[in-house]
Interface confidence: medium
C-alpha cells in the first residue's frame, strides 16, 4: 500500500506516534517519506547483507527476522514480512522500540539527513487530524 501524506499522518497518530519520545508527528511522516516514499512494501538491501523493510525501513540485522541476515538480533521479535503489511501496526510498534533505544530518530538515516532540523510540521499541514 502507498499511503497518502495525510492518510499516513492520521494512521500514525491513531497508533500513538505523535510526540512519542518527544518526536512530533511531522517527524514520523517526514521519515516515512524519505525512507519509503510512503510505500509499506518497500525493501532495500544493504551492503552488510541486511535488508530494510516497510514504510519506516526497519533493518533486519537488528530489529526483525528475515531468515537470512547473519547474526540477526530480531529485537522487535517479528518476521520482517510483517513490516510490509498495509496495516502499519507492526512497523509502528517496532519503531517505538527503536526510537526508545538511545539514539532517538537518529536511527533513521533518512530522517537525520532529510528531516532533522527542518520544518517537519509542513508534512502534516492541511491534514485533518
Amino acid at each position: 500500500k502507498v499511503f497518502g501524506r495525510c492518510e499516513l499522518a492520521a494512521a500514525m497518530k491513531r497508533h500513538g506516534l505523535d510526540n512519542y519520545r518527544g518526536y512530533s508527528l511531522g517527524n514520523w511522516v517526514c521519515a516515512a517519506k524519505f525512507e519509503s516514499n510512503f510505500n509499506t512494501q518497500a525493501t532495500n538491501r544493504n551492503t552488510d547483507g541486511s535488508t530494510d523493510y516497510g514504510i519506516l525501513q526497519i533493518n533486519s540485522r537488528w530489529w526483525c527476522n528475515d531468515g537470512r541476515t547473519p547474526g540477526s538480533r530480531n529485537l522487535c521479535n517479528i518476521p520482517c514480512s510483517a513490516l510490509l503489511s498495509s496495516d502499519i501496526t507492526a512497523s509502528v510498534n517496532c519503531a517505538k522500540k527503536i526510537v526508545s533505544d538511545g539514539n532517538g530518530m537518529n536511527a533513521w538515516v533518512a530522517w537525520r539527513n532529510r528531516c532533522k532540523g527542518t520544518d517537519v510540521q509542513a508534512w502534516i499541514r492541511g491534514c485533518r487530524l
Partner: antibody, heavy 116, light 107 residues
Framework: QVQLQESGAEVMKPGASVKISCKAT????????IEWVKQRPGHGLEWIGE????????YYNEKFKGKATFTADTSSNTAYMQLSSLTSEDSAVYYC?????????WGQGTTLTVSS | DIELTQSPATLSVTPGDSVSLSCRAS??????LHWYQQKPHESPRLLIK???QRESGIPSRFSGSGSGTDFTLSINSVETEDFGMYFC?????????FGGGTKLEIK
C-alpha cells in the same frame, strides 16, 4: 520438515515462454525469500534472483532482467518463475531454494530444454 | 559482481586421502562464503556455511576455513560417497555468485 517441490521437465520451442513452479511446505512460506538458480553444464550455478512471497518484493540479477519474472501465491505456498523469449541458451536445470543467505533447502530442479 | 575462483578444477584422489579445495574471491567477503556438494542428477547440498560452520548432519571429516578472499574446504580421509562436484557461494553482496566448481573424482 522443509521441502520445495518443483514442477516437471519442460520441452519448449524457441520464442515461447514457460512458467516453473516451486511449492513450499514445512515452514512459513511468506516470511522467507525464495531464490532461483540456473545450472547449465560447463557454466556452473548462476543466481537469477529472489522473491519475498509475503510482499511480492523481487530482485533480479541484471543478467536476467527481462528474461525471468517471479511471482508467488501465498494461498498455495507456491512460487513461480516465468522465462520468456526462450532460446537454446535457456536450456538448463532451474532450482528454487529457500534464501537464508546460504541455501540449505533446494527443490529437486526443473529441466528445461529449448529446441525447435 | 564478486567473482569466485575455485581450484583445482578437478582433483583425482584415492579413498582415505585427505584433500583441500580452494575458493578465492575477487574482493573481500569477510566470512560470507558457503560450500556445497552436488552429485550427478541431484540438487546441491549445503556442507559449510559462513566459511567454517558445518551444517547439521554433515560428517565431521568436512571442515572449512578462511576469511576475506581465501577459503578452503578440507575433507579428512575421503570416502567413496564424497565424490562429486563442490561449489562455493558468496552471500556478501548481490548478485549472489558461485564458484565454477571442483570435481572430486576417484583416481
Amino acid at each position: 520438515q522443509v521441502q520445495l517441490q518443483e514442477s516437471g521437465a519442460e520441452v519448449m520451442k524457441p520464442g515461447a515462454s514457460v512458467k516453473i513452479s516451486c511449492k513450499a511446505t514445512g515452514y512459513t512460506f511468506s516470511t522467507y525469500w525464495i531464490e532461483w538458480v540456473k545450472q547449465r553444464p560447463g557454466h556452473g550455478l548462476e543466481w537469477i534472483g529472489e522473491i519475498l512471497p509475503g510482499s511480492g518484493s523481487t530482485y533480479y540479477n541484471e543478467k536476467f532482467k527481462g528474461k525471468a519474472t517471479f511471482t508467488a501465491d501465498t494461498s498455495s505456498n507456491t512460487a513461480y518463475m516465468q522465462l520468456s523469449s526462450l532460446t537454446s541458451e535457456d536450456s538448463a536445470v532451474y532450482y528454487c531454494a529457500r534464501g537464508d543467505g546460504w541455501y540449505c533447502y533446494w527443490g529437486q530442479g526443473t529441466t528445461l530444454t529449448v529446441s525447435s | 559482481d564478486i567473482e569466485l575462483t575455485q581450484s583445482p578444477a578437478t582433483l583425482s584422489v584415492t579413498p582415505g586421502d585427505s584433500v583441500s579445495l580452494s575458493c578465492r574471491a575477487s574482493q573481500s567477503i569477510s566470512n560470507n562464503l558457503h560450500w556445497y556438494q552436488q552429485k550427478p542428477h541431484e540438487s546441491p547440498r549445503l556442507l559449510i556455511k559462513y566459511a567454517s560452520q558445518r551444517e547439521s548432519g554433515i560428517p565431521s571429516r568436512f571442515s572449512g576455513s578462511g576469511s576475506g578472499t581465501d577459503f578452503t574446504l578440507s575433507i579428512n580421509s575421503v570416502e567413496t560417497e564424497d565424490f562429486g562436484m563442490y561449489f562455493c557461494q558468496q552471500s556478501n553482496s548481490w548478485p549472489r555468485t558461485f564458484g565454477g566448481g571442483t570435481k572430486l573424482e576417484i583416481k
